[in-house]
């Protein structure tokens, strides 16, 4: 028979032969032959392989370095790497989460559109007309201007995106 030129899923071609890949959590010890199956070996503690593979070495679990603001979100297994996230108030600088930076605060005139998570920074938005923010904060949204009318007061000073309106008593008309 003709030697194969392509192999099925979870197989690989070697020496004109299709061999089974090693399952996640195991590494390759020796390729299959005409007479023997692929020989695989489990990864040890602190190691993993997360795909069907023909790797001869397992990978080391990632270290979530507290000096970089990292902590373990989920311990690794023989089939998965450690998942790192950031300490409270910090977020990852990349998808791989290799280091963390402090959450950004929204300046006065801007409010928090989306609060930061361990993996994403704060998203700020300018306070639209009718809203204000007078603080620098990673949590505060834009607040609506005070409604003077509902308090039977009048606007004495107009609000801005950084300040609330100032209400005052209505002028009494004298007869």
């Amino acid at each position: 028979p003709e030697p194969p030129t392509a192999c099925r899923e979870k197989q690989y071609l070697i020496n004109s032969q299709c061999c089974s890949l090693c399952q996640p959590g195991q590494k390759l010890v020796s390729d299959c032959t005409e007479f023997t199956e692929t020989e695989c070996l489990p990864c040890g503690e602190s190691e993993f392989l997360d795909t069907w593979n023909r790797e001869t070495h397992c990978h080391q679990h990632k270290y979530c370095d507290p000096n970089l603001g990292l902590r373990v979100q989920q311990k690794g297994t023989s089939e998965t790497d450690t998942i790192c996230t950031c300490e409270e108030g910090w977020h990852c600088t990349s998808e791989a989460c290799e280091s963390c930076v402090l959450h950004r605060s929204c300046s006065p005139g801007f409010g928090v559109k989306q609060i930061a998570t361990g993996v994403s920074d704060t998203i700020c938005e300018p306070c639209p007309v009718g809203f204000f923010s007078n603080v620098s904060s990673a949590f505060e949204k834009c607040h609506p201007w005070t409604s003077c009318e509902t308090k039977d007061l009048v606007v004495q000073q107009a609000g801005t995106n950084k300040t609330d309106v100032v209400c005052g008593p209505q002028d009494r008309l004298r007869a």
């Epitope: 590494k27 070996l41 990864c43 503690e45 190691e47 080391q60 270290y63």
Partner: antibody, heavy 118, light 106 residues
């Protein structure tokens, strides 16, 4: 300071039990597996078992199944190893140690000497 | 259980000597760990994942091997290297140590 601190030396009578503690400071014990290792006087190292402090999952060497019980209290970052029905051959230094990451290389406690004597 | 046979059990050597310690596993393991222990002290990890030096370990230490046969080499023995050395496999439960090799001054 990053370390594992074990409880002090114990002298026990045959048949009694002893509970050795191992407390982590400067790191989160839940991020590691904690192993217990026995070293009898003048002898080599013997792996007893390991516990995952996060969920309490434990594995024991057959020789220590029924002899040792490992538990964890993550609120105090402490792992315990209790030895029951003590005999003279349980006299040894017991060490706790963690799994390693490339960056920490595993931590070891200072060891706890347990002496079993009538 | 995987049996770990370490040899020699003891050796005498002089400062500057090249020292080789072997560890043979009864079945293939993924990697070997090597520890150094000095009297009255806790063991210290020297080599992880068969051939990688732990932080702060001098480059005169090296590890090699695969499958069932592993080696720890000290290229030029120093006075502070006189100690007992242990191999350990952490692939199959129960994890097991070798019997140890005591390196003494000749």
């Amino acid at each position: 300071q990053v370390q594992l601190v074990q409880s002090g030396a114990e002298v026990k009578k045959p048949g009694a039990s002893v509970k050795v503690s191992c407390t982590a400071s400067g790191f989160n014990i839940k991020d590691y597996y904690v192993h217990w290792v026995k070293q009898a006087p003048g002898q080599g190292l013997e792996w007893m078992g390991r516990i995952d402090p996060e969920d309490g999952d434990s594995k024991y060497a057959p020789k220590f199944q029924g002899k040792a019980t490992m538990t964890a209290d993550t609120s105090t970052s402490t792992v315990y190893m209790e030895l029951s029905s003590l005999r003279s051959e349980d006299t040894a230094v017991y060490y706790c140690t963690t799994s390693y990451y490339v960056g920490t290389y595993g931590y070891w406690g200072q060891g706890t000497l347990v002496t079993v004597s009538s | 259980d995987i049996q770990m046979t370490q040899s020699p059990s003891s050796l005498s050597a002089s400062v500057g000597d090249r020292v080789t310690i072997t560890c043979s596993a009864s079945s293939s393991v993924s990697y070997m760990l090597w520890f150094q222990q000095k009297p009255g002290k806790a063991p210290k990890l020297l080599i992880y994942s068969t051939s990688n030096l732990a932080s702060g370990v001098p480059s005169r230490f090296s590890g090699s091997g695969s499958g069932t046969d592993f080696t720890l080499t000290i290229s030029s023995l120093q006075p502070e290297d006189f100690a007992t050395y242990y191999c350990q496999q952490r692939t199959f439960y129960p994890y097991t140590f070798g019997g140890g090799t005591k390196v003494e001054i000749k």
